[in-house]
């Protein structure tokens, strides 16, 4: 029996993808007055143009350039927070510390966060059944190429002290194969970035180990130092208290180590 539609290993395009992107764009441009000039219909057209009618294993950064151009945004380059395998806490942090930005606090990151999308070669259809998996199918798929493109640009824009939140509960606290390890680390600009400060987030309540001494953190320090960027590291032993103290810094319990 012939298969009319390519079956990929990953989940298909998120339900109501076009409407979601458009709604998020409207939302973002209202909340950020400096982005009010953005025409959300044009943004959607550029987004769609990056992957529709193209083979979903043959997407390039070039395909996303019209979208990148429309989504050009200036964020304070010294207020950038990168993260790896700990997105929720990073986002909770920037919700409270509103002068800091994760990639998902920029227009393009906000549009695509948690979404999946792909098209089909030579048809204008969006594939809601399945999309390529990065490992099992191909790495040059629409979602992976998008995040690689925006992550590179975000890292390139950073300056002064750049912070990164890392998950201390994982076997590899720093993973060379993560977006942070494979893209962002290598695109920080030594002539602009003075220091990369890692915040290692502890998972266990009673975990008092110094995870800044972890071999993978030492590996990160080595990579960063070789790029002529200083490295520092802090343990965040109590992420719940950490967030609470960001919300209420005057709280008396916030002077002790968190």
């Amino acid at each position: 029996v012939p298969r009319w539609r390519q079956q990929w290993s990953g989940p298909g395009t998120t339900k109501r993808f076009p409407e979601t992107v458009l709604a998020r764009c409207v939302k973002y441009t209202e909340i950020h007055p400096e982005m009010r000039h953005v025409d959300c219909q044009s943004v959607w057209d550029a987004f769609k143009g990056a992957f529709i009618s193209k083979h979903p294993c043959n997407i390039t950064e070039e395909d996303y350039q019209p979208l990148m151009k429309l989504g050009t945004q200036t964020v304070p380059c010294n207020k950038i927070l990168l993260w790896s395998r700990i997105k929720d806490l990073a986002h909770q942090f920037t919700q409270v510390q509103r002068d800091m930005f994760t990639l998902e606090d920029t227009l393009l990151g906000y549009l695509a966060d948690d979404l999946t999308w792909c098209g089909e070669f030579n048809t204008s259809k969006i594939n809601y059944q399945s999309c390529p998996d990065w490992r099992k199918d191909c790495s040059n798929n629409p979602v992976s190429v998008f995040w690689k493109t925006v992550s590179r640009r975000f890292a390139e824009a950073a300056c002064d002290v750049v912070h990164v939140m890392l998950n201390g509960s994982r076997s590899k606290i720093f993973d060379k194969n993560s977006t942070f390890g494979s893209v962002e680390v290598h695109n920080l600009q030594p002539e602009k970035v003075q220091t990369l400060e890692a915040w290692v987030i502890h998972g266990g309540r009673e975990d008092s180990r110094d995870l800044c001494q972890d071999p993978t953190i030492k590996e990160l320090e080595s990579i960063i130092s070789k790029r002529n960027i200083q490295f520092s590291c802090k343990n965040i032993y109590r992420p719940d208290k950490f967030l609470q103290c960001v919300k209420n810094p005057e709280d008396s319990s916030c002077t002790s180590e968190i």
Partner: antibody, heavy 122, light 107 residues
């Protein structure tokens, strides 16, 4: 505890002005976006206005645009609604409400005041 | 402006019943929707935001679902204190419009 208390309501003639206040306590007022919402007698809820945590941005319902002004004084933990050129259809209970402090104003309104009644009548 | 239409406007039910209220948006609003409960003479109370996230302290018998243009609020087993008026509100773009309300009455 976290509390919002409105004041300043009353009976006023059409075309006149009134200023409502909303006193906040129990939380760091300057960290939260704030809203005014009104409810006409026997009717549903109507969103009136929003102001950013730092006062930098404001939006209004079309029905009040150009007549009402939302403002805040973070040093006094107080939200205001200046209502000019009042009309009979502005008669309602006016509630102030707090955004949960989310960056994108997408968490609803998690704390509400009990409301102050404004009656516009000749 | 985005219009929200709730159905039904009135609903009679008994303690223990499972009830569902629907809210339809005039255009896609992703998951930017909240639900409130209001009792006579009282201020509204936030039940759900982001279409399906339960606000802290709200009993688990309340749940929300949907995205885009169609949303539902479900109360799995009605309790005496649940008889009230329920409103949906879109949080996608200003003005943050409300639905007209659904009055839930004791049968």
């Amino acid at each position: 505890q976290v509390q919002l208390v409105e004041s300043g309501g009353g009976v006023v003639q059409p075309g006149r002005s009134l200023r409502l206040s909303c006193a906040a306590s129990g939380f760091t007022f300057s960290s939260y976006g704030m809203y005014w919402v009104r409810q006409a007698p026997g009717k549903g809820l109507e969103w009136v206005a929003v102001i950013w945590y730092d006062g930098s941005n404001k939006y209004y319902a079309d029905s009040v645009k150009g007549r009402f002004t939302i403002s805040r004084d973070n040093s006094k933990n107080t939200l205001y609604l200046q209502m000019n050129s009042l009309r009979a259809e502005d008669t309602a209970v006016y509630h102030c409400a707090r955004d949960p402090g989310l960056r994108y104003f997408d968490g609803g309104m998690d704390v509400w005041g009990q409301g102050t009644t404004v009656t516009v009548s000749s | 402006d985005i219009q929200l239409t709730q159905s039904p406007s009135f609903l009679s039910a008994s303690v223990g019943d499972r009830v569902t209220i629907t809210c339809r948006a005039s255009q896609g609003i992703s998951s930017y929707l909240a639900w409130y409960q209001q009792k006579p003479g009282k201020a509204p109370k936030l039940l759900i935001f982001a279409a399906s996230t339960l606000h802290s302290g709200v009993p688990s018998r309340f749940s929300g679902s949907g995205s885009g243009t169609e949303f539902t609020l479900t109360i799995s087993s009605l309790q005496p204190e649940d008889f009230a008026t329920y409103y949906c509100q879109q949080l996608n773009s200003f003005p943050y419009t409300f639905g007209q309300g659904t009055k839930l009455e004791i049968k």
